[in-house]
């Protein structure tokens, strides 16, 4: 698969590649863009190019058949004809068909080929598709890009996160022209440098919720543990002690005891990562020492942990609202009323209980409101509309307030029961006691970081100050790594 140049040479790579002597793609109406292929992506790309004022020429093996699927303004022709008409070409065919263009290499000399392909699996081939294309067409300027965009997004117009396109090429001018083209198509181009980045760009669309995997596993593990914990305490214990069958509690009551604990634990994990990062920087007296991989991964997953916390809190609210609707609740209510009448009790009002429930429901609603605000500001379009100060205030300050109020919600829910022996079934503490452990540690940690002596030192470290001992040791093997000014959640 090699191409040996023995005579002649490709045109200078620094030349302008576009027709009509346009340097860069400033005026779309004058530019003809080629698209090789006639699949869904090619169709959607063509529609977008036309909408943005470009003239499009489609190269197809079967132009007669392909022309039926494209707008009439599009020039659908043979590959060879298409390649002679344009200098910027989208290669919208699968990797295994690249070689079908091989006979036309001489028509591609000095032209920009934009590889938009993806594979079926991560690292499916030894080299990226773009690098393979470059090996087949050494005299062409290969640019990787647009592969992270779906055909759907191309047709409808990109929204939010789908506006980002990653672009890389070994030729700076070619890369710049494709970046400009991406802007003209209303995308946000991200320059990833040389073609060696193509492998990573090609792997991006194949990653299925990479940052979500860890948080989801953590959430499921916590949910399983707390569900079994509640099941043992609230179903197995009464059955073992009094042969009392409370299995009806499993679908709603046990689940609803699990959900809030998972929610508050996940929310605590969001802020615990930031505290550990701060502790790490304080310990080493520098912000330039890279965090250990586990902490770095944890810090990257905070948004996902926060959103999962919000999800569990929302489901907890839904379950709680449904509690009075249950048939079991009605029966218990009637039984209590009957027993009250039977015991000749006219007034069962308990001021303390009334206040307790009013308070914990109120705190619950407040914390849900704050969590909702945190979740909404995690949406890319919303976070993009906020400046860094606003964003970090919502995510960090209000986030801690949400955690504090959630902790009060749990504390008031538990009330005195943490100190009553009857609630320690099988010698295990009540659920809410377990739920309070992590939030309490996080809140305590935050208070410690607020202490003037520590907060001053942390501020200095974040401004670039370093412990002299660290400087004496030298920074051999360390990588500059700056943690965010404020710890953000979602």
């Amino acid at each position: 698969m090699e191409s040996i140049s023995m005579m002649g040479s490709p045109k200078s790579l620094s030349e302008t590649f576009l027709p009509n002597g346009i340097n860069g793609i400033k005026d779309a109406r004058k530019v003809t863009v080629g698209v090789i292929g006639s699949g869904d992506f090619a169709k959607s790309l063509t529609i977008r190019l036309i909408r943005c004022g470009y003239h499009v020429v489609i190269g197809s093996r079967n132009p007669k058949f392909a022309s039926e699927f494209f707008p009439h303004v599009v020039d659908v022709t043979h590959h060879e004809d298409a390649l002679t008409k344009t200098n910027i070409i989208f290669v919208a065919i699968h990797r295994e068909h690249y070689t079908s263009l091989w006979d036309l290499r001489h028509l591609l000399v000095g032209k920009i080929l934009i590889d938009v392909s993806n594979n079926m699996r991560i690292n499916q081939y030894p080299e990226s598709n773009a690098e393979y294309l470059a090996s087949l067409f050494p005299d062409s300027l290969i640019v990787k890009g647009f592969n992270v965009v779906s055909a759907w997004a191309l047709q409808l117009g990109p929204k939010d996160a789908s506006r980002q396109v990653y672009i890389c090429s070994n030729n700076i001018q070619a890369r710049q022209q494709v970046i400009e083209l991406a802007r003209q198509l209303n995308f946000i181009p991200i320059d990833l440098g040389s073609l060696s980045s193509a492998r990573e760009i090609e792997n991006l669309p194949l990653r299925l919720f990479t940052l979500w995997r860890g948080p989801v596993v953590v959430a499921i593990s916590l949910a399983t543990f707390f569900f079994l914990y509640s099941f043992v305490r609230d179903v197995i214990h009464p059955y073992a002690r009094n042969q009392q069958s409370d299995f009806y509690k499993i679908p709603i009551e046990i689940v609803n005891k699990t959900l809030p604990i998972v929610a508050i634990t996940l929310l605590s994990l969001v802020y615990l990562a930031g505290l550990l990062a701060a502790a790490y920087q304080l310990y080493y007296g520098t912000k330039y020492r890279r965090f250990p991989p586990w902490l770095e991964t944890w810090l990257q997953c905070r948004k996902q942990l926060g959103l999962l916390s919000f999800f569990f809190a929302m489901v907890h609210v839904a379950y709680s609202l449904c509690l009075p609707m249950r048939r079991s609740e009605r029966y218990l209510f009637l039984n209590m009323a009957y027993q009250q009448v039977h015991a000749n009790i006219e007034n069962s009002w308990n001021e303390e209980e009334v206040w307790r429930i009013e308070m914990y429901i109120s705190f619950g609603i407040m914390s849900l409101g704050l969590l909702s605000l945190l979740a909404v500001t995690s949406i890319p379009s919303v976070s993009n509309a906020l400046n860094w100060r606003e964003f970090s205030f919502i995510q960090s300050t209000l986030g801690y307030v949400a955690l504090l109020i959630s902790t009060f919600h749990v504390l008031i829910y538990g009330w005195k029961r943490a100190f009553e022996e009857e609630y320690y079934r099988f010698y295990t503490p009540p659920n809410f006691v377990l739920a309070l452990v992590l939030p309490s540690i996080v809140i305590l940690g935050k208070i410690i970081l607020f202490l003037p002596c520590i907060s001053r030192k942390l501020k200095r470290i974040k401004k670039g100050w370093e412990k002299s001992q660290f400087l004496e040791e030298g920074m051999g093997g360390t990588i500059p790594h700056v943690s965010p000014e404020r710890v953000t959640v979602m």
Epitope: M1, E2, S3, I4, S5, M6, M7, G8, S9, R61, N62, H78, H79, E80, E96, H97, T99, S100, W102, D103, L104, R105, H106, L107, V109
Partner: antibody
Framework: QVQLQQSGPGLVKPSQTLSLTCAIS??????????WNWIRQSPSRGLEWLGR?????????DYVVSVKSRIIFNPDTSKNQFSLQLNSVTPEDTAVYYC??????????????WGQGTLVTVSS | EIVMTQSPVTLSVSPGERATLSCWAS??????LAWYQQKPGQAPRLLIY???TRATGIPARFSGSGSGTGFTLTISSLQSEDFAVYYC?????????FGPGTKVDIK
């Protein structure tokens, strides 16, 4: 009428270089609408395309992966011929070697004209 | 690379009878397929290209059909000079590949 006349030794020793030449008449090696190919045929491998050379404002040489590291095609415009050089031969390279033309207006066509073939035996 | 397969390996036919040879490609080759005839001690000769177009000087009894992955060469009435080995070859994708051949012999 295009004619391809092959020449070269029929016996080559292992690890040596196999050299064959294909002289063209009725067409030009530097034609813009033709590609010049080498194909070999052995009982074990059947017909195997080895590669091609063609001219489109510069020379392009394409080699099949299996022999890519050992093979060289040399077009000679002055003599209107092209040659095959296969280095470090082994007994597995024993085959009948053919040169053939492809009409190539942009896209490859079939092998429409073939040389008479040269049986090359690799043996010590 | 595209793998070409042919069937049958050997076809025994009486002169004057019809012979049908099949060729399959491991992936679509569109209509970029050629058929060759090879007699002992000779170079292959082009019969059909573009899956169905007869090459110059090829008698009308030879016909080709198919596209994509399945192709057929039909010899309507076998003559004595038609007993040979027939190869199919794809020239759609690099590297160009041949089938293993079908030997047509006298029954």
């Amino acid at each position: 009428q295009v004619q391809l006349q092959q020449s070269g030794p029929g016996l080559v020793k292992p690890s040596q270089t196999l050299s064959l030449t294909c002289a063209i008449s009725g067409d030009s090696v530097s034609s813009n609408s033709a590609a010049w190919n080498w194909i070999r045929q052995s009982p074990s491998r059947g017909l195997e395309w080895l590669g091609r050379t063609y001219y489109r404002s510069k020379w392009y040489n394409d080699y099949v992966v299996s022999v890519k590291s050992r093979i060289i095609f040399n077009p000679d415009t002055s003599k209107n011929q092209f040659s095959l050089q296969l280095n470090s031969v082994t007994p597995e390279d024993t085959a009948v070697y053919y040169c053939a033309r492809v009409r190539q207006d942009y896209r490859s066509g079939p092998f429409d004209y073939w040389g008479q073939g040269t049986l090359v035996t690799v043996s010590s | 690379e595209i793998v070409m397969t042919q069937s049958p390996v050997t076809l025994s036919v009486s002169p004057g009878e019809r012979a049908t040879l099949s060729c399959w490609a491991s992936q679509s080759v569109s209509s970029s397929l050629a058929w060759y005839q090879q007699k002992p001690g000779q170079a292959p000769r082009l019969l059909i290209y573009g899956a169905s177009t007869r090459a110059t000087g090829i008698p009308a009894r030879f016909s080709g059909s198919g596209s994509g992955t399945g192709f057929t060469l039909t010899i309507s009435s076998l003559q004595s000079e038609d007993f040979a080995v027939y190869y199919c070859q794809q020239y759609n994708n690099w590297p160009f590949t041949f089938g293993p051949g079908t030997k047509v012999d006298i029954k």
